[in-house]
Amino acid sequence: ELCDDDPPEIPHATFKAMAYKEGTMLNCECKRGFRRIKSGSLYMLCTGNSSHSSWDNQCQCTSSATRNTTKQVTPQPEEQKERKTTEMQSPMQPVDQASLPGHCREPPPWENEATERIYHFVVGQMVYYQCVQGYRALHRGPAESVCKMTHGKTRWTQPQLICTGEMETSQFPGEEKPQASPEGRPESETSCLVTTTDFQIQTEMAATMETSIFTTEYQ
């Protein structure tokens, strides 16, 4: 089941998926001056069986000016620079795919890919948020959002991250910073059954993501 909306935006924060649930689609978009090859796929699809998930189809772009097809290669470093979508830095790489059954990793870039990746997420997908450079987390409750099915409709949970540019905040004396609680909201908050995610194991990682960079855009 595809999620109806985009994940919520948080002021002065960006979000990124660590891995993508089976059923996720990534549009094959090309940068200006390029187009999909005639016989090319419209999108890549995360598919798999119980033991292995991978992206079906390959995105291929060709120059709008020429009719011949292009070869599928990894961009050169200088081409990579113009992409807005950056991979997580190595310490923040998602848990190994094998330990996340039913999920695909970030697809590798393709030649002349558009600067913005447009994903179509499915129920159970989780995305993680962090404050952008120059802002810090005033409050870091659950810094993630999950696409859930509630009353037959999909909805993203609201991340409880507040990013502030104000450096002068008051911290009351004599109080140690408590640990963020991993259990999230209790079931008593929802009035009917919701579809939850099997992606809980990423929660610990989310709390340590402050130094990582992610700027992929989603839709």
Epitope: P8, E9, I10, P11, H12, L138, H139, R140, G141, P142, Q158, P159, Q160, L161, I162, T164, G165, E166, T169, S170, Q171, F172, E175, K177, P178, A180, S181, E183, G184, R185, P186, S188, E189
Partner: antibody
Framework: QVQLVQSGAEVKKPGASVKVSCKGS????????MHWVRQAPGQGLEWMGV????????IYAQKFQGRVTMTVDTSTSTAYMELSSLRSEDTAVYYC????????WGQGTTVTVSS | DIQMTQSPSSLSASVGDRVTITCRAS??????LEWYQQKPGKAPKLLIY???TLAEGVPSRFSGSGSGTDFTLTISSLQPEDFATYYC?????????FGQGTKLEIK
């Protein structure tokens, strides 16, 4: 179910301080920041500030800077708002509200400042 | 600080009417806007968050739209229990200011 229960009404003299409490239940208290909002009689809503129930960091509206102190006690899942140097214009209903989108509110605490 | 201006300040309507309240921000606030309903002697209640998402348990006759600086709260068919005061508020940056309110009265 989620509940924010505030302390009872207070009558204070000008120059005094008042401390209003807000106890959260039915959810994980440290997951959600707590905001404080007040409403003078017949007036609109005025945001006073926000405190992280996780770290204790707080940001106050400029208007209340130096007079307001927000604290939390995670052991009792309670947030506090203390307003000092009270004047008659501080007569209002004070509310606590939970999270980024103020999805749950306390019932309000009436503070009357009168000589 | 970001100023939030609601219009109209008050509004008379009848049960079954379609009602629209607007809120304008003094600068671009993307979709970081909430709508609240308040009845006399009661705490405000969240209706819409992130400009267009209906809060849990809120009837579908309420809807929100807009982005940037101009936002709208629409009640498609007014019910007797909808007569109240409505406030918009942004959460783009502190201070999180509110609109001055729109009082919806029975005609």
């Amino acid at each position: 179910q989620v509940q924010l229960v505030q302390s009872g009404a207070e009558v204070k003299k000008p120059g005094a301080s008042v401390k209003v409490s807000c106890k959260g239940s039915g959810y994980t208290f440290t997951d959600y920041a707590m905001h404080w909002v007040r409403q003078a009689p017949g007036q609109g809503l005025e945001w006073m500030g926000v405190i992280s129930t996780y770290s204790g960091d707080a940001i106050y509206a400029q208007k209340f800077q130096g007079r307001v102190t927000m604290t939390v006690d995670t052991s009792t899942s309670t947030a506090y708002m203390e307003l000092s140097s009270l004047r008659s214009e501080d007569t209002a209903v004070y509310y606590c509200a939970r999270g980024v989108t103020f999805d749950y509110w306390g019932q309000g605490t009436t503070v009357t400042v009168s000589s | 600080d970001i100023q939030m201006t609601q219009s109209p300040s008050s509004l008379s309507a009848s049960v079954g009417d379609r009602v629209t309240i607007t809120c304008r921000a003094s600068q671009d606030i993307s979709n970081y806007l909430e709508w609240y309903q308040q009845k006399p002697g009661k705490a405000p209640k969240l209706l819409i968050y992130n400009a267009k998402t209906l809060a849990e348990g809120v009837p579908s006759r309420f809807s929100g739209s807009g982005s940037g600086t101009d936002f709208t709260l629409t009640i498609s068919s007014l019910q007797p229990e909808d007569f109240a005061t409505y406030y918009c508020q942004h959460h783009y940056d502190t201070p999180y200011t509110f609109g001055q309110g729109t009082k919806l009265e029975i005609k």
